[in-house]
């Protein structure tokens, strides 16, 4: 039922145009010498969105986009120089695109940038309180950014910084062939993975990293990479993508002898994100394009949303996949995949598996192995030679809870919100897409929390030309959702409710959780408001119940509750 | 200079027990594995067990699992073998040797332990 | 477990000569062999490391070569104190285990 026909025609569908005279959007359209708007850093502690782009990094006030600060950062005309005589395009490469944009420290970000094929970093200072109004480079203190950010303005970077470190998988070099996950910054001897072995990375796309805890003890904390990749021979036939989950103990040093300045817990498993075909042959969405995680209440198991698109050119399609940490972690305790020579199938390992397992964090409180660099050499051995798993991890309900395959365009960022509703909790996704379009989509448990119907609420065009969304943060301070592409950044709010009607049933079949009819209008829903006054009903749409002539009040008094 | 002296070697009756220690000296004693190999008379090199840095964990081949356990106190810079459930075949001289996370670089001069039925 | 065939048991050499010593393991342990020298009455001592790695005070006429399954030891030019018994050591896996030996003796 994840492409029930009705539910796939949006409910609203509004254009740029009508967005702008319903106020429902406010774009920067960016600046004639700038582009690329893809890095985003949300601060809502300061109300600021801190957006790197061709040398240029932003601060926009989170209230209204057209308030903004900017620096320019731009490459040294020698550097361009270099860089055009190696061949490169003067506008589309040979500039400062800026790939990573972190908050450093109270009173600073870090920033990397693709230098004119030169990586470079710096540091912004932004005060320490928002009203100290500062947004200014450090001009004395730029640091090298290879490892950091890629050469190639047409690559990503996943990164994350954590404690003073920097997490990132990139492109090391000039060619763009040695991608690898680094820990760079901080006091220790930067780390990487291992080089030219394609049973590590084998041409990675980087999507994203995220710290998650393991357990309550720090020690067991992980980085996790979402990545999509070449499928390694003989795991495939013919080539494929696979997307990727990796994992990094963050307490990781290297090894001892082997392994040393390399990870010693990475391991890889792949993400299946597929619909039943015909024939029994699986329809995969294997592409990987974002992944949003959406914690609640139980930061080591957040809910993973994965957006995934086709591999083919032929079938063209779009899929939003979730996937529980707990599926994950049992994939990283289960077999290893091995194979005896490089014309061999892969196999799950059978074999004697060393203690500690690897891929497990070193902490006193597991057999007192303090440190990666205390692990037998079997340990690294087997690490090196095993870093992926056999089985795969499937998503919740083993199939996408969205899939769109008629449609001329491909989903490729995804946010999510949790909305409380009248009847219970919604995750509410806004999907970005490759021609400058958001849905709005709620997914609403039926029988079972694991069985999900997917309402299409709205579509919106955000730009004005048809433009890839590649950046999408949503401020639940401010109820506001941002969007980058290469044109400029768009503001518009979660929620638009008078937009649905001026009648209490076309609020209610809506079934958006952000809105109910308070007897006059239909208006943003509130939990703390006063029940009576509000007429609601996500899981059903039913107006007949909400909204019957016995008015609101009477209806209230015998409503069941969903939860 | 690297030192390690063997003690507690003896004569024990079939099934008895024997507690084995070595003094380690010359070097930070908690930064190594530490591990014990032993030589029946005429015979080769045998490998008995090897505990980590921290002590909080010990490997064993399947010859002595069970009734062997080797521990460490970083204190006292002193390394132990617990000899359990004694057979004919673990009469031998034990050697107590640094390292076992990589090659055993030095060895102690060993001490004999003799099991008689 | 892994085990390691040294051979020849005995080799027979006169001073001055070279000698080859050779350890096979029974599966692939990369470059994990170590080999020790042993003499009468004495505990092993280390000679080389991760197959091919020299150890301060000991003879440059020693040297290892290998990996895989195939190991060598090799004394250039063989003194009167090298003779002894020569074990190798996988440390790839555990269980670590020694290789029966091979004693080089004066011909």
């Known amino acids: 039922n994840y492409q029930n026909g009705k539910n796939n025609v949006p409910r609203l569908k509004l254009s740029y145009k009508e967005m702008l005279e319903s106020n429902n959007v406010i774009t920067f359209n960016g600046l004639a010498n700038s582009s690329s708007y893809h890095t985003f850093l949300l601060d809502e502690e300061r109300s600021r969105l801190y957006v790197g782009a061709k040398d240029h990094i932003f601060s926009f006030n989170l209230v209204n986009i057209k308030d903004f600060q900017k620096i320019v950062w731009p490459v040294s005309y020698t550097r361009r120089d270099e860089c055009k005589w190696a061949g490169k395009d003067i506008l589309k490469e040979c500039a400062n695109f800026i790939k990573v944009l972190k908050a450093y420290n109270q009173t600073h970000l870090y920033a990397c940038g693709t230098g004119a094929f030169h990586p470079i970093c710096t540091y912004i200072e932004i005060g320490h309180h928002p009203e100290d109004n500062i947004f200014k480079l450090e001009n004395s203190h730029f640091e090298n950014g290879r490892g950091k950010s890629p050469y190639d303005p047409k690559l990503l970077t996943a990164s994350l910084l954590i404690d003073g470190e920097l997490y990132s998988g990139t492109a090391a070099d000039f060619m763009g062939r040695d991608f690898a996950i680094f820990r760079t910054l901080g006091h220790h001897h930067p780390i990487r993975t291992e080089q030219h072995d394609s049973r590590w990375l084998n041409d990675p796309r980087f999507i994203s990293a995220h710290l998650i805890p393991e357990s309550d003890n720090p020690e067991d904390d992980k980085v996790y990479f979402f990545f999509r990749e070449n499928a390694i021979d003989g795991e495939h036939s013919g080539k494929a993508t696979h997307a990727r989950i990796g994992q990094i103990c963050k307490n990781d040093f290297g090894g001892h002898r082997s392994l040393v300045n390399k990870w010693t817990t990475f391991l890889k498993a792949r993400l299946i994100c597929s619909v039943p075909g015909p024939n029994g042959i699986d329809t995969h969405f294997d592409e990987l394009q974002d992944v949003f995680l959406m914690n609640f209440k139980d930061p080591k198991n957040p809910i993973v949303y994965g957006v995934f698109t086709t591999s083919s050119n032929i079938f063209k399609g779009s899929a939003v996949c979730m996937y529980s940490m707990s599926d994950v972690r049992r994939v990283f305790l289960g077999p290893y995949a091995h194979r005896d020579g490089p014309n061999y199938q892969w196999v799950p390992y059978q074999g004697r598996v060393p203690y500690p397992r690897p891929g497990t964090c070193p902490s006193k409180t597991f057999g007192g192995f303090d440190s990666t660099k205390d692990l037998p050499d079997d340990v690294i051995t087997f690490a090196r030679s095993h870093p992926a798993m056999y089985n795969p991890v499937f998503p919740i309900n083993n199939r996408p809870i969205m899939i769109k395959t008629d449609v001329n365009y491909q989903f490729t960022q995804i946010v999510v919100d949790r909305v409380d509703a009248e009847d219970g909790q919604y995750d509410v996704m806004f999907i970005g897409t490759d021609v400058g379009t958001v849905l709005k989509v709620v997914s609403i448990p039926k029988e079972t929390w694991h069985d999900l119907e997917e309402v299409l609420l709205e579509e919106m065009t955000v730009f004005r030309e048809p433009t890839t969304i590649s950046a999408m943060e949503l401020s639940t301070k401010q109820q506001q959702l941002y969007i980058g592409s290469t044109a400029g950044i768009a503001q518009l709010p979660l929620h638009r409710c008078d937009i649905y009607g001026k009648a209490c049933a076309e609020c209610c079949l809506a079934r958006d959780p952000y809105c109910a009819w308070d007897g006059s209008s239909c208006s943003r829903y509130f939990p703390t408001a006063k029940a009576r006054t509000r007429a609601q009903d996500i899981r059903n749409g039913d107006p007949l119940t909400h909204c019957s002539d016995g008015g609101i009040e009477g209806r209230m008094d015998h409503h069941h509750h969903h939860h | 200079e690297v030192q390690l002296v063997e003690s507690g070697g003896g004569l024990v009756q079939l099934g008895g027990s024997l507690r084995l220690s070595c003094a380690a000296s010359?070097?930070?004693?908690?930064?190594?594995?530490m591990s014990w190999v032993r030589q029946a008379p005429g015979k080769g090199l045998e490998w008995v067990s090897t505990i980590i840095k921290s002590g909080g964990y010990a490997y064993y081949p399947d010859s002595v699992k069970d009734r062997f356990t080797i521990s460490r106190d970083n204190s006292k810079n002193t390394l132990y073998l617990q000899m359990n459930s004694l057979r004919a075949e673990d009469t031998a001289v034990y050697y107590c040797?640094?390292?076992?996370?990589?090659?055993?670089?030095?060895w102690g001069q060993g001490t004999t332990v003799t099991v008689s039925s | 477990e892994i085990v390691l065939t040294q051979s020849p048991a005995t080799l027979s050499l006169s001073p001055g000569e070279r000698a080859t010593l050779s350890c096979r393991a029974s599966?692939?342990?990369?470059?994990?062999l170590h080999w020790y020298q042993q003499k009468p009455g004495q505990a092993p001592r280390l000679l080389i490391y991760y197959a091919s790695q020299s150890i301060s005070g000991i003879p440059a006429r020693f040297s290892g070569s290998g990996s895989g399954t195939d190991f060598t030891l090799t004394i250039s030019s063989l003194e009167p104190e090298d003779f002894a018994v020569y074990y190798c050591q996988q440390g790839y896996s555990f269980p670590y285990t020694f290789g029966g030996g091979t004693k080089l003796e004066i011909k």
């Open positions: 599966q692939s342990i990369g470059d994990y």
């Open positions: 040797v640094k390292g076992g996370q990589g090659a055993m670089d030095y």
């Open positions: 010359g070097f930070t004693f908690s930064s190594y594995y």
